[in-house]
């Protein structure tokens, strides 16, 4: 059998396999030794058995979308059934004081690995053996420590594949320079080590994205907004965009990024190198927020100018792929990290991304303030009680709620909170009247509402002990 | 084509109000702000404000805030500017403007209006 | 709100002749500015849009440069057409702000 019998159906076209290259991969054209690695169709009864207690799920993730000539990575995460675990040592065993369908097991390992490599090797003194190998019979290579590694990992995509030993958990990384653009098929098988065998215990796939487009998302900030996610804002008061860039490898550090905003409220184009803006929009109704991002990042050169006659059929100068994976010190494939470009050749080529939105302005209340704190005379039953007229003002629309949250002086526990509703005037003038429990110092925070906005203000008040003496004490501000 | 036809020539009393109109034909009259601009003979341009005809949302320039006020009819996708208390200083051509399809300032002015006020 | 200081008021300059108008902001205003032609009786015209960019349908003796907060109109060649009043406007905030205008007269 081949690699690609084995690990899926999906085949790209001819073309598709001679530029899609990626370096430190091989062709699944290979051939697949079966003894070693058993091929199970989906649905094979021998599945039910391939893990003791379960069955193992692998999760797959990329940090797609990529864009072109960025490093994507991938990471397999398996998933044991419940109370096992993988020890430090690589063996699989059973959690402590964990009850699964079976109960308790008496016998420590699932799969104790180190005591089978140690009875079942029958090694040459290097180490190397005809079973240590992988599928396509290429020996595992010997990090340090390797003997703990008992998971086989066959990663395929574009025709290629690329084969990994790893412990429960293992990540590659891809060059994507030459990866045709959109949706691509990345599928794993995963085989476990069974004596001088291997057993397939779990395959999964996901889809990945490559793309010339920056991926782009921003989020939107503004003080009093009472709900960030919605895309409504309010009037007068500036909202702050920040422009966040999928670049988990980091492939535009050294790039100048140049962002282009138009706020859809015919204030004309701010353009900055900064990835924060803050727009303040002083008309309420629906504006489409366009936001462009443009990059300078590495990318292909441009063919050299043909030469004067062609002697004979130069070789392509397109960029290969390179992997290389995180467990190990270099690059998974024999040849070092760098791009196999012709020497000192070095272009650049601007990239864009493109962000869009609608966005909603209303009115909201912009300001709240405490203008007045008044002490209310007290009738004689409650000495221990004091209570406080708040005289507040707003700014912007009419407040439809009220909220007190009272705290101990470093505004961080909280001791009470009520809301009530308001029935406000167009002054926006009103008392708000609250009991305090005793003497001390008190945090009040204290919000103003309506549907779309929630201003907050806070002060730090000191009430006096109570005179048990005196019925009644004079009102004073 | 774009335009902005606006009403005609106004002669009205000290203390009164005038309602001038901008109507508005070639687009969506909703998707574009209607700006308002004053000149008195023979001075320069001055911004009075702004409408929102998508949603009535409105922008004053400090000094217009009590004297103009801007409305829109989606209907007749037409703009108005109410000038109230009116005095002599008032006496000026209105103008009525538009920005492109792009975020770009005025493209296109309504012809004006001439409001004299005189006893 | 943003001052937008025009000079000169006004000016008088010969058929073919090469001539400049500034405008200053009192903010960084990027490239968002305006310049506006405005004939006796007549609504302001459209000249140039994004500090530099032409607007359709005008001539090419009439170019704009500048970013920030500083400004200019530069008409080369001067025809007998191109006397009228002229104003910026920045458009970056509102309040829009208008130059104070230039008077360009025939000499």
């Known amino acids: 059998k081949r690699f690609h019998d084995v690990l899926g159906n999906e085949r790209p076209s001819a073309y598709m396999r001679e530029h899609n290259q990626l370096n430190g991969w091989s062709s699944d054209e290979n051939d697949w030794n079966e003894k070693l690695y058993p091929v199970w169709k989906r649905g094979d009864m021998r599945w039910k058995n391939s893990w003791k207690g379960g069955r193992v799920q692998a999760v797959l993730t990329s940090d797609s979308p990529a864009l072109v000539g960025s490093n994507i990575t991938f990471a397999v995460n398996l998933i044991f059934p419940r109370c096992q675990k993988e020890d430090a040592n690589g063996n699989i065993v059973y959690e402590k004081n964990c009850r699964n369908e079976a109960g308790l097991s008496a016998d420590p390992y699932v799969y104790n690995w180190t005591a089978w490599s140690e009875d079942s090797d029958g090694e040459n003194g290097t180490g190397q053996s005809h079973h240590n190998v992988f599928p396509d019979g290429k020996p595992f290579p010997h990090h340090p420590g390797w003997r703990r590694w008992n998971f086989i990992y066959v990663f395929h995509t574009l025709g290629q594949y690329f084969q990994k030993l790893g412990r429960c958990s293992v990540r590659v990384s891809v060059n994507t320079a030459n990866v045709t653009l959109g949706p691509q098929l990345m599928e794993v098988t995963v085989y476990r080590r069974h004596g001088r065998a291997y057993v397939p215990i779990a395959q999964v796939k996901d889809v990945y994205v490559v793309t010339d487009q920056i991926p782009v998302f921003v989020t939107m900030f503004q003080k009093n907004d009472r709900n960030s996610s919605d895309e409504t804002f309010l009037k007068d008061l500036p909202i702050m965009f920040d422009v966040l860039i999928h670049d988990p490898s980091h492939f535009l550090n050294y790039s100048t990024i140049n962002y282009k905003w138009s706020f859809g409220d015919n204030t004309g184009l701010f353009v900055s190198t900064n990835h924060t803006v803050n727009h303040t929009y002083v008309l309420n109704g629906t504006f489409s927020l366009n936001l462009t991002v443009k990059a300078a990042a590495p990318g292909p050169c441009p063919p050299p100018p043909p030469p004067p006659r062609p002697s004979k059929p130069t070789p392509s100068l397109a960029t290969t792929l390179k992997s290389y994976d995180s467990n190990t010190p270099g690059p998974a494939g024999d040849n070092p990290l760098e791009l196999s470009r012709i020497p000192d050749e070095n272009c650049q080529i601007n990239r864009y991304g493109h962000f869009q939105a609608t966005i909603t302005i209303v009115e909201g209340i912009l300001e709240v303030n405490i203008i007045q704190m008044t002490d209310v005379l007290m009738p004689v039953p409650w000495p221990e009680s004091s209570l406080i007229d708040f005289v507040v003002t707003c700014q912007g629309s009419i407040p439809t709620e009220v909220c007190t949250i009272i705290s101990d002086p470093t505004c961080e526990i909280t001791q009470n909170t009520v809301c009530s509703p308001v029935d406000v005037d167009e002054m926006c003038l009103l008392t708000v009247r609250r009991t305090f429990n005793g003497s001390g110092t008190y945090c009040v925070n204290l919000t103003l509402g309506d549907d779309t906005s929630l201003a907050l203000t806070s002060t730090l008040i000191s009430v006096p002990d109570r005179d048990p003496a005196s019925p009644l004490r004079m009102a004073n501000s | 084509q774009v335009q902005l036809q606006q009403s005609g020539a106004e002669l009205v009393r000290p203390g009164t109000s005038v309602k001038v109109s901008c109507k508005a034909s070639?687009?969506?009259?909703?998707?574009?702000?209607i700006e308002w601009v004053k000149q008195r003979p023979g001075q320069g341009l001055e911004w009075i404000g702004v409408i929102n005809p998508g949603s009535g949302g409105t922008n004053y320039i400090e000094k217009f805030k009590g004297k103009a006020t801007l409305t829109a009819d989606k209907s007749s996708s037409t703009a108005y500017m109410q000038l109230s208390s009116l005095t002599s200083d008032d006496s000026a051509v209105y103008f009525c403007?538009?920005?492109?399809?792009?975020?770009?300032?005025?493209?296109?002015w309504g012809q004006g209006t001439l409001v004299t006020v005189s006893a | 709100e943003i001052q937008m200081t025009q000079s000169p008021s006004s000016m008088s300059a010969s058929l073919g002749d090469r001539i400049t108008i500034t405008c200053q902001a009192t903010?960084?205003?990027?490239?968002?500015l305006n310049w506006y032609q405005q004939k006796p009786g007549k609504p302001p015209s459209f000249l140039i849009y994004?500090?530099?960019e032409l607007a359709e349908g005008v001539p090419s003796r009439f170019s704009g440069s500048g970013s920030g907060s500083d400004f200019s109109l530069t008409i080369s060649n001067l025809e007998s057409e191109d006397f009228a009043d002229y104003y910026c406007?920045?458009?970056?905030?509102?309040?829009?702000?208008f130059g104070g205008g230039t008077k360009l007269e025939i000499k």
């Open positions: 403007a538009r920005g492109a399809n792009w975020d770009v300032g005025f493209a296109y």
């Open positions: 994004y500090a530099t």
């Open positions: 070639g687009y969506a009259f909703s998707n574009h702000l």
């Open positions: 406007l920045q458009f970056h905030e509102f309040p829009r702000t």
């Open positions: 903010q960084d205003i990027v490239k968002n």
